[in-house]
Interface confidence: low
């Protein structure tokens, strides 16, 4: 049979050719009469055997990771006879592994973040790296990590790769690391081989940092003149942090006066400080407020960061503003009576210079003739007044002032002309009555009513009577319904058209105001030739055709 | 070289305050914390508090809370420490130290130091 | 007493290594930055280690800074006779929300 021991052949032998081992049959005496001979993939090229003795040779330099083993396989044959002396048989050459391989970290590139400041023993990634020699043989592939770079901030587990935070770390100081792992095989002993990877550790931010204003003091200012809602300036902090760790509110922690407010700019994280309340110069020129600045967002584990906000000293000086004239009143109503002299008072306004400088102020009345205006603000008349044709004015009143004319104010003035009892009262109309020939006594010939431009305090009453004469005459009566109007009435039968064609009848009207008014109106009565009815109609119809020139029959 | 410069001695009665002036030269003044910490006569350093200029942030140390304010002048890139209801222990060498732009982060230069003596 | 503890003295002959170390606790050392200052006879302190071992410019490397844990140590190598001064260890503290300094080192170089 066959005699052979496991052949082993060392990888990366440099020598031209290397003793494998032997291959024998025991049935070889030694005698060289048998010749060996090797088959398979290899055989020749790789390795060859002498064929008398059956020593195998690799003539070529191995690669144990390219291929680990070689299967073959070999004859032996009797040169004399010629035929075989053992069956042919396989056999297998095993190249052994020397260290020849450095440990590889094939999923570099390796990136990682992890938060800032995290607490010692913080995993952050975990490197691997490959060694292409035999895990089976020594140490060859057994690996240790260790840190080139990256102390004191991160370690390296030696055995896992597993990378932690070792110290704490501050992303505003420094926000990416590049670590540097070795991957040693031999466990690190001597004649080790070694690889290298770099890690690059992002920090990512934690709020860490409270909002700091820039300055302890910002000095603003603000015209009196500025609508509420005005942006009078704005204030900065600053924040370490970035993203919505540095998104920042601020706030008013001290204005006893509530006169300004703060908003946030969320875009540029600016402060605006805005006008809540108008200001006024001559009241108080300046202003003194504290703001504070926060993060928007704090999460509970970091408030140790956030104790006290900081906060910043805001003063405001308030400009001045040449402002117009302020009258004591927005509007004046004054009465008068009528029919009171030229030059008579009617009232005062009184408008001031609401600036520190107190000019004096000048006084005019826009478009009227009626009355004045003196330097006092004291309104007069220019004329009589009637209010019969006017009861009451609307004046434009102007001030100015007198250091700056430009500053104007105007107000309006309503003036109540007063009633007086100037006025008698009178007909209400023209009236021509009728009456007829054969009249009888008591027929009612007219009814007259009457005015007075006056007004009445209360309701007009009027008092109708007939004039002393025509009361004598008595071809007429009147009689007062005593509401405002009254009826006349014959006081005699018939009239005589030839003798008396026409009345005139005078009726004295008189009012009841204080002192009493009265008037003469004459009615005219005509004396007409009626039909039998005793209708009027026809006298009114001559009448008519009469003062148009035209006669009747 | 970054240089502080603080104010000369001074000599002060029990009760009374004391401030005393670090100028700052040579840097960015507004980016870095100021710390004071003072040394009586042998003995060692003691941490009083710290300033961030810029906004005027102060952390006092329990010890001196209520009686020490620290405040900055971004004009002139002075920071002052005044000390009040002063003590005979009081009296010692007080140092302003520039720190980092972390308040745990070491200090690199130290002032030339005042010495503030306590004495009726 | 201090939050930081330093043995109050040290000492060691020219050439000499020694150690000076600073106890704390998790607050402080155990999740902040540890520097140590020198202190010179009659002068203001100068940063000597920052950051746990860091080194500002001008410093020599026989002096190094180490932290484990809650505690921190300065080591000094090759002694001469300009080390002779007072160390201290500083470091932030969490809970205190304030810096805390060890009491001090004494360091004397003897002979």
């Known amino acids: 049979g066959w005699v052979w021991n496991q052949f082993f052949v060392p990888e990366e032998m440099n020598t031209t050719s290397h003793h494998v081992g032997r291959l024998r049959s025991d049935l070889d005496n030694g005698n060289n009469s048998f010749q060996y001979k090797l088959l398979g993939a290899g055989a020749g090229s790789t390795f060859i055997i002498d064929e008398r003795t059956g020593d195998i040779y690799a003539i070529e330099k191995l690669d144990r990771e390219e291929r680990s083993l070689y299967i073959l396989r070999a004859q032996v044959i009797d040169i004399t006879t010629g035929r075989a002396v053992e069956p042919e048989s396989e056999f297998v050459i095993k190249v052994s592994d020397i260290n020849d391989n450095e440990p590889k970290f094939l999923d570099e590139p390796y990136e990682a973040i992890v938060p800032e400041m995290s607490p010692e023993g913080t995993l952050v990634i975990q490197v691997t790296a490959s060694d292409a020699d035999d895990p089976s043989s020594g140490n060859n592939a057994r690996l240790l990590y260790s840190l080139l770079q990256g102390q004191p901030y991160f370690s390296v587990e030696p055995t896992t790769g597993v990378i932690r935070i070792s110290s704490k770390m501050d992303r505003e100081l420094q926000d990416e690391y590049w670590v540097i792992i070795q991957a040693k095989d031999m466990i690190g002993q001597p004649g080790a081989l070694s690889g290298t990877t770099s890690v690059l550790i992002k920090l990512s931010d934690v709020n860490d940092n409270k909002p700091i204003f820039k300055e302890s003091l910002y000095r603003l200012t603000v015209s009196e003149s500025a609508p509420t809602g005005t942006s009078i300036g704005t204030i900065m902090a600053y924040d370490n942090d970035i993203g919505e760790n540095a998104e920042m509110d601020y706030s008013i922690e001290e204005d006893d006066s509530q006169t300004f407010d703060i908003i946030t700019n969320h875009e540029t994280q600016e402060g605006i400080v805005i006008l809540k309340k108008k200001v006024n110069f001559e009241h108080q020129n300046h202003y003194g407020i504290r703001a504070k600045v926060k993060n928007h967002h704090v999460d509970k584990q970091l408030m140790k960061y956030h104790t006290e906000a900081s906060t910043t000293f805001i003063k405001i000086q308030v400009e001045d503003v040449d402002e117009p004239p302020l009258f004591l009143l927005p509007y004046y109503i004054f009465e008068i009576f009528e029919e009171t002299p030229q030059g008579s008072f009617v009232g005062v306004v009184s408008a001031t210079d609401p600036d520190n400088r107190k000019s004096p102020i000048r006084y005019s009345i826009t478009r009227s003739k009626v009355f004045n205006i003196d330097d006092n603000g004291t309104i007069t008349t220019t004329n009589s007044l009637d209010r019969e044709i006017s009861a009451w004015y609307n004046l434009s009143i102007t001030a100015t002032e007198k250091y700056n004319i430009e500053q104007i104010s105007s107000i309006p003035v309503y003036v109540q002309v007063l009633n007086i009892n100037d006025h008698a009262p009178e007909f209400s109309q023209y009236y021509e009555s009728y009456v007829c020939e054969n009249a009888g006594s008591g027929q009612v010939i007219q009814t007259i009513s009457a005015v007075d431009r006056d007004e009445s305090i209360e309701e007009h009453h009027f008092y109708f009577n007939l004039s002393v004469e025509d009361t004598n005459s008595s071809s007429f009566t009147i009689i007062d319904n005593q509401d405002n109007t009254a009826v006349i009435l014959t006081n005699r039968t018939g009239f005589n058209l030839q003798e008396e064609p026409i009345f005139y009848i005078s009726i004295l009207i008189a009012d009841n105001g204080i002192p009493s008014l009265t008037s003469t109106n004459t009615l005219t009565i005509h004396v007409c030739d009626c039909d039998d009815s005793g209708s009027t109609q026809t006298c009114q119809y001559q009448e008519l055709m009469l003062s148009m020139g035209f006669k009747t029959e | 070289q970054v240089q502080l410069v603080q104010s000369g001695a001074e000599v002060k009665k029990p009760g009374a305050s004391v401030k005393v002036s670090c100028k700052a030269s040579?840097?960015?003044?507004?980016?870095?914390?100021m710390s004071w910490v003072r040394q009586a006569p042998g003995q060692g350093l003691e941490w009083m508090g710290i300033?961030?200029?810029?906004?005027?942030?102060?952390t006092y140390a329990q010890k001196f809370q209520g009686r020490v304010t620290m405040t900055g002048d971004t004009s002139t890139s002075t920071v002052y420490m005044e000390l009040s209801s002063l003590r005979s222990e009081d009296t010692a060498v007080y140092y302003c130290?520039?720190?980092?732009?972390?308040?745990?982060?070491?200090?690199?230069?130290w002032g030339q130091g005042t010495l503030v003596t306590v004495s009726s | 007493h201090s939050v930081l503890t330093q043995s109050p003295s040290a000492s060691g002959t020219p050439g000499q290594r020694v150690t000076i170390s600073c106890s704390g606790s998790?607050?402080?050392?155990?999740?902040?930055?540890v520097n140590w200052y020198q202190q010179l006879p009659g002068t203001a302190p100068k940063l000597l280690i920052y950051?746990?071992?860091q080194r500002p410019s001008g410093v020599p490397d026989r002096f190094s800074g180490s932290k484990s844990g809650t505690s921190a140590s300065l080591a000094i190598s090759g002694l001469q006779s300009e080390d002779e001064a007072d160390y201290y260890c500083?470091?932030?503290?969490?809970?205190?929300?304030?810096?805390?300094f060890g009491g001090g080192t004494k360091l004397t170089v003897l002979g």
């Open positions: 130290a520039r720190g980092g732009i972390k308040l745990w982060l070491h200090f690199d230069y």
């Open positions: 040579r840097y960015t003044f507004t980016s870095y914390y």
């Open positions: 300033i961030h200029p810029s906004g005027g942030d102060t």
């Open positions: 998790r607050s402080n050392i155990g999740s902040n930055f």
């Open positions: 950051t746990n071992n």
């Open positions: 500083a470091v932030w503290d969490d809970s205190l929300n304030g810096w805390v």
